[in-house]
């Protein structure tokens, strides 16, 4: 029997390479049974995850799963960092794994670093 707990399917240690100035949608895949839970996004600052209050979000519904989307329109250099979604379900807080955005600022980067350079040498993001 399938569990009716809410589950947040952000992949563990997932990473995204994105360009400043581009639009980007960060998806939080949500599985639920009956009532859609209240889901929020936060951005990690050290060990604290700061709730993103004034950001554009939306839901996308598919057959077996729903997506709570955080919109970046456009991506800004300071959007670089790790994000997490969380859901309130039956008085419980369910937290996703964090997902990391590596933002390349096209104005200051003469050549776009590879995804692996950004993962292993994050200072490239701030040149």
């Amino acid at each position: 029997k399938e569990s009716c707990d809410v589950q947040l399917y952000i992949k563990r240690q997932s990473e995204h390479s994105i360009l400043a100035g581009d639009p980007f949608e960060l998806e939080c895949p949500v599985k639920y049974c009956a009532n859609r839970p209240h889901v929020t996004w936060c951005k990690l600052n050290g060990t604290t995850c700061v709730k993103l209050e004034d950001r554009q979000t939306s839901w996308k519904e598919e057959k077996n799963i729903s997506f709570f989307i955080l919109h970046f329109e456009p991506v800004l250099p300071n959007d670089n960092g790790s994000y997490r979604c969380s859901a309130n379900f039956q008085s419980n807080l369910i937290e996703s794994h964090s997902t990391t955005l590596y933002v390349t600022d096209v104005k200051s980067a003469s050549e776009r670093p590879s995804k692996d350079e950004m993962a292993s040498r994050p200072w490239l993001l701030y040149r």
Partner: antibody, heavy 120, light 112 residues
Framework: QVQLQESGPGLVKPSGTLSLTCADS????????IHWVRQPPGKGLEWIGR????????RYNPSFKSRATISSDKSKNQASLKLSSVTAADTAVYYC?????????????WGQGTTVTVSS | DIVMTQSPDSLALSLGERATINCKSS???????????LNWFQQKPGQPPKRLIY???KLDSGVPDRFSGSGSGTDFTLTISSVQAEDVAVYYC?????????FGQGTKLEIK
């Protein structure tokens, strides 16, 4: 049923490029990570790297960083490995493996492996 | 890189004896999510590795309960309570917490 199947040339010339494909069935690769692991004759297992097929983001073992390229094709449900400037030391059995998703994140399914010999 | 050191490199036991394989990591494998991504694989000649144990102690489906895993932080153990002929194989630990992922060098189990 989850299956992974590696394929590619069994013989590669020194200084050439090794190219392998991992054809996956029974699951959607974009929901997982695909890893490549190799095993030289009579030796242990060596992790080469992994890809997130959902967005193409890769991670490599620094030992292979400059020579390895992992890619994926969601439409074909397959992943690929290219290893450039090969030498005899790259002779090995090459495996692709799936990292299952929530909540365990471990290599739960492997291909049978394909033997690659580097020789002129 | 995280170095995974297994001991012993090989062991030869009689049928029914207890096998203990140790794996030591150079750093803690406890992840930020509170889980420890330490796995054990069994590899028989001419076959790909097969997952036996994940998250330190969870047994894969179909794996006999004579296999067990334990440990935390940097020290882990695979135990076979009563070795059977079909357990002859090489056993590898693997860490999935840090990049790059790393395997132990392997422990070869033989029957005396």
């Amino acid at each position: 049923q989850v299956q992974l199947q590696e394929s590619g040339p069994g013989l590669v010339k020194p200084s050439g490029t090794l190219s392998l494909t991992c054809a996956d069935s029974g699951f959607n690769i974009k929901d997982t990570y695909i890893h490549w692991v190799r095993q030289p004759p009579g030796k242990g297992l060596e992790w080469i790297g992994r890809i997130d097929p959902a967005n193409g983001f890769t991670r490599y073992n620094p030992s292979f960083k400059s020579r390895a390229t992992i890619s994926s094709d969601k439409s074909k449900n397959q992943a690929s490995l290219k290893l450039s400037s090969v030498t005899a030391a790259d002779t090995a059995v090459y495996y692709c493996a799936r990292e299952d998703g929530y909540p365990y994140y471990t290599l739960d399914a492997w291909g049978q492996g394909t033997t690659v010999t580097v020789s002129s | 890189d995280i170095v995974m050191t297994q001991s012993p490199d090989s062991l030869a036991l009689s049928l029914g004896e207890r096998a203990t394989i140790n794996c030591k990591s150079s750093q803690s494998l406890l992840d930020v999510d509170g889980k420890t991504y330490l796995n054990w694989f069994q590899q028989k000649p001419g076959q790909p590795p097969k997952r036996l144990i994940y998250l330190v102690s969870k047994l894969d489906s179909g794996v006999p309960d004579r296999f067990s895993g334990s440990g935390s932080g940097t020290d882990f153990t695979l135990t076979i309570s009563s070795v059977q002929a079909e357990d002859v194989a090489v056993y590898y630990c693997w860490q999935g917490t840090h990049f790059p992922r790393t395997f132990g060098q392997g422990t070869k189990l033989e029957i005396k």
